[in-house]
C-alpha cells in the first residue's frame, strides 16, 4: 500500500516531507511567499492529498502560480508607470503613480511607489492599499506673470494662460419678465469651485433679502481669453451657489460667495486654480502690488447680450489686466468718509489704486481676483475680490477700488468646499 514518491511543485513544498508514504498518509502542498496553489484553475493557499488503499494518491500535485495584483487602479488626474519590464503585475513588481504635472501634485509628497504584495494587492509604504491623491496645483500660471515694477499697467492685453484662474460668470435670471442677464468674474479655487463676490450672485431686482440667484441661472466660462471666441473655453453650469450668510446689501460687508460646478473641470495651461491665502486678519500689506484681470466690459453702452453672443465686438474682447498697490486702510477709510453718501470701509475690506487715479478695477469685473505673488511659496494668491467703488468715474483721483479681504474668510471657504485645511495647506505654503 505504498504511494509513489512525491515531487514538490516549483516554488512550493510538501509537508510532511517523508521518504515513503503509506495508506492514510496525508500531505499538505503549499507555495512559497508570493505564490498560490493552483488546482483545476482554482487558486488556494494550501491543498491536501491522501495516500489511498490501492497505493495511489487522491489527487495530482497542484502547481504554484505567482501572485498577480492585476492592473492597478486608475488614479484621477494621474498616470501609472511600470518599473518592471513587460509591464508585469506579479509579486514584487513595482509601479509608480504620478500626477499630471504641472497641473496636479501628489498630496503629502508621496513617492507614489506601490509594490505587488504576497496577498495580491498593490501596497504603498505609507498609504497601504489606498491610492494617492492628486490635488490641483495652484497659483502657478503656465506663463510667467510680468515682474511687478511700480508703474500702472492698464488695459494691457493678457496673454492666454496668464490668468488661468479667471472665470467669467454669466447669470440669466429667467424668473423676471423680461429675463435679466448680467455678468461678473470669479477665480477658480479647485477643479470644482469658483470664488466670487456675493453681489454677483444675488438677484439684481428688488429682492430685499439676500437671496442667491437660482443655480440653473448661472453659467461659468473658464479658459476664456477672447469673449468673441468661446470655442476653446470650458463652460459649466452650477451645482450650488453659496453666498456668505452675513453678506450685507447696504454696505457690501462680507461680499464673498462660492459656486460649485456641476462637473470638475479638466485643468490645463489655460485652466488652473489660484491659491488661497493663509488665515491672517491683517490682509495684504499696504503698498504691496497686486494684479486684477477682467474683460474690461465697463462701457455702459455695451450690453451683456452683446458680450455673450459670439461675433459681437466690444471694447475689450480680450482679457485685460491692471497692476495696483494696496492702499493703507486708514487712508482709504478717510477718502470715503470725506464723501457724501454712507460709505463704510470695514475690516473685511481693503483698498487698492493710485491717489492720482488713472487706473482702477473698471478693468476687472466684480468678483474678479486681486492676486499677489507670495515669495514664500512662489505662487499667486487671491487676496481680494473686486467688490465696490465710489460714485465718481472709476479711475478718478483719490477714489480707490474696494476689495473683499479674502484672508478673513479662508476657514469659511474650506468649510464650504468640504475640505479640511490640512489637506490643502501644502499647496499654499512650501
Amino acid at each position: 500500500n505504498e504511494c509513489p514518491e512525491l515531487q514538490p511543485p516549483v516554488h512550493g513544498k510538501i509537508e510532511p516531507s517523508q521518504a515513503k508514504y503509506f495508506f492514510k498518509d496525508q500531505v499538505l502542498v503549499s507555495c512559497d511567499t508570493g505564490y498560490k496553489v493552483l488546482k483545476d484553475n482554482v487558486e488556494m493557499d494550501t491543498f491536501q492529498i491522501e495516500c489511498l488503499k490501492d497505493g495511489t494518491w487522491s489527487n495530482k500535485i497542484p502547481t504554484c502560480k505567482i501572485v498577480d495584483c492585476r492592473a492597478p487602479g486608475e488614479l484621477e488626474h494621474g498616470l501609472i508607470t511600470f518599473s518592471t519590464r513587460n509591464n508585469l503585475t506579479t509579486y514584487k513588481s513595482e509601479i509608480k503613480y504620478s500626477c499630471q504635472e504641472p497641473y496636479y501634485k501628489m498630496l503629502n509628497n508621496n513617492t507614489g511607489i506601490y509594490t505587488c504584495s504576497a496577498q495580491g494587492v498593490w501596497m504603498n509604504k505609507v498609504l497601504g492599499r489606498s491610492l494617492p491623491t492628486c490635488l490641483p496645483e495652484c497659483g502657478q500660471p503656465s506663463r510667467s506673470l510680468p515682474s511687478l515694477v511700480k508703474r500702472i499697467i492698464g488695459g494691457r492685453n493678457a496673454e492666454p494662460g496668464l490668468f488661468p484662474w479667471q472665470a467669467l460668470i454669466v447669470v440669466e435670471d429667467t424668473s423676471r419678465v423680461p429675463n435679466d442677464k448680467w455678468f461678473g468674474s470669479g477665480a477658480l479655487l479647485s477643479a470644482s469651485w469658483i470664488l466670487t463676490a456675493a453681489h454677483v450672485l444675488r438677484s439684481q431686482r428688488r429682492d430685499t433679502t439676500v437671496i442667491p440667484v437660482s443655480k440653473e441661472h448661472v453659467t461659468v466660462y473658464l479658459g476664456l481669453h477672447d469673449v468673441r471666441d468661446k470655442s476653446g473655453a470650458v463652460n459649466s453650469s452650477a451645482a450650488r451657489v453659496v453666498l456668505h450668510p452675513d453678506f450685507n446689501i447696504q454696505n457690501y460687508n462680507h461680499d464673498i460667495a462660492l459656486v460649485q460646478l456641476q462637473e470638475p473641470v479638466p485643468l490645463g495651461p489655460h485652466v488652473m486654480p489660484v491659491c488661497l491665502p493663509r488665515l491672517e486678519p491683517e490682509g495684504p500689506a499696504p503698498h504691496m502690488l497686486g494684479l486684477v484681470a477682467g474683460w474690461g466690459i465697463s462701457n455702459p453702452n455695451v450690453t451683456v447680450d452683446e458680450i455673450i453672443s459670439s461675433g459681437t465686438r466690444t471694447l475689450s474682447d480680450v482679457l485685460q489686466y491692471v497692476k495696483l498697490p494696496v492702499v493703507p486702510h486708514a487712508e482709504c477709510k478717510t477718502s470715503y468718509e470725506s464723501r457724501s453718501g454712507n460709505y463704510s470701509v470695514t475690516e473685511n475690506m481693503f483698498c487698492a489704486g493710485y491717489y492720482e487715479g488713472g487706473k482702477d478695477t473698471c478693468l476687472g469685473d466684480s468678483g474678479g481676483a486681486f492676486v499677489i505673488f507670495d515669495d514664500l511659496s512662489q505662487r499667486w494668491v487671491v487676496q481680494g475680490l473686486v467688490s465696490w467703488g465710489g460714485p465718481e468715474e472709476c479711475g478718478s483721483k483719490q477714489v480707490y477700488g474696494v476689495y473683499t479681504k479674502v484672508s478673513n474668510y479662508v476657514d469659511w471657504v474650506w468649510e464650504q468646499m468640504g475640505l479640511p485645511q490640512s489637506v490643502v495647506e501644502p499647496q499654499v505654503e512650501r
Epitope: 424668473s175 423676471r176 448680467w182 454677483v200 439684481q204 431686482r205 428688488r206 455702459p300 451683456v304
Partner: antibody, heavy 113, light 112 residues
Amino acid sequence: QVQLVQSGAEVKKPGASVKVSCKASGYTFTGKWIEWVRQAPGQGLEWIGEILPGTGSTNYAQKFQGRATFTADSSTSTAYMELSSLRSEDTAVYYCLRSEDVWGQGTLVTVSS
Amino acid sequence: DIVMTQSPDSLAVSLGERATINCKSSQSLLNSRTRKNYLAWYQQKPGQPPKLLIYWASTRESGVPDRFSGSGSGTDFTLTISSLQAEDVAVYYCKQSYNIPTFGQGTKVEIK
C-alpha cells in the same frame, strides 16, 4: 398664450379678510414672479408685493407688510393674495400680473359696513 | 421708497401730433451690473387692466406699434407717441422695478 384669470368680485365688512385667486396658464407657473397691484376707484396704481411660486420667496411693499399674505399652489398654477384687517380705503380693483408683462382682468373688492 | 413723478398730469394733443410724457425718479434706475434702466411704461384704457408698452426704458414690447418709443436713463425718462391715434386715448403710467416697485401718478392723454 399666457393668461391670468382672477376670481370674482367680493364685498367685505371692515375688519374682515379677503382672499383673491389668480390662475395662470400658458407658461411654467413656478418659474416666474407673480406681482399684485391695486387701483382704488379713479386713482393710480399701487404695488402690493410679489411671490415666486417655485420657491415661495416673497417681497412686500412696506405699507402692506404684515397685512398682505401671498401663497401659491403649483399643482393648480394658482397664486393667492390675502388681505386682512380690511378698511374702507382698501376698496379697489386688485390685479395680479406675471412679473411685468401680462395682467389678470382684475378683482373688485368692496369694503363696506 | 423710490418716488416716481410724472408730468404733465394730463395732455391734450391733436390727432397725428406728437405726445410726450415725462417721468422722473427720486434715484437712479440704472443697474450697473445689468446695464439696464428698470423703468416700464403702461397704457390703461377705462375698465381694462394696464398693458405693457415699454420695458428697460426703451425696449418696445412685442406687438406694440412703433409710434410708441421710450428714452432716458438714470432718473429722467420720456414716453413719446410720435403720431397720436384715436385709440391711444388712455392713462399712461411709468413704473420703476429697480427696487420695491412704485408707479408714477399717471398722465391722461386726450384728443384736442
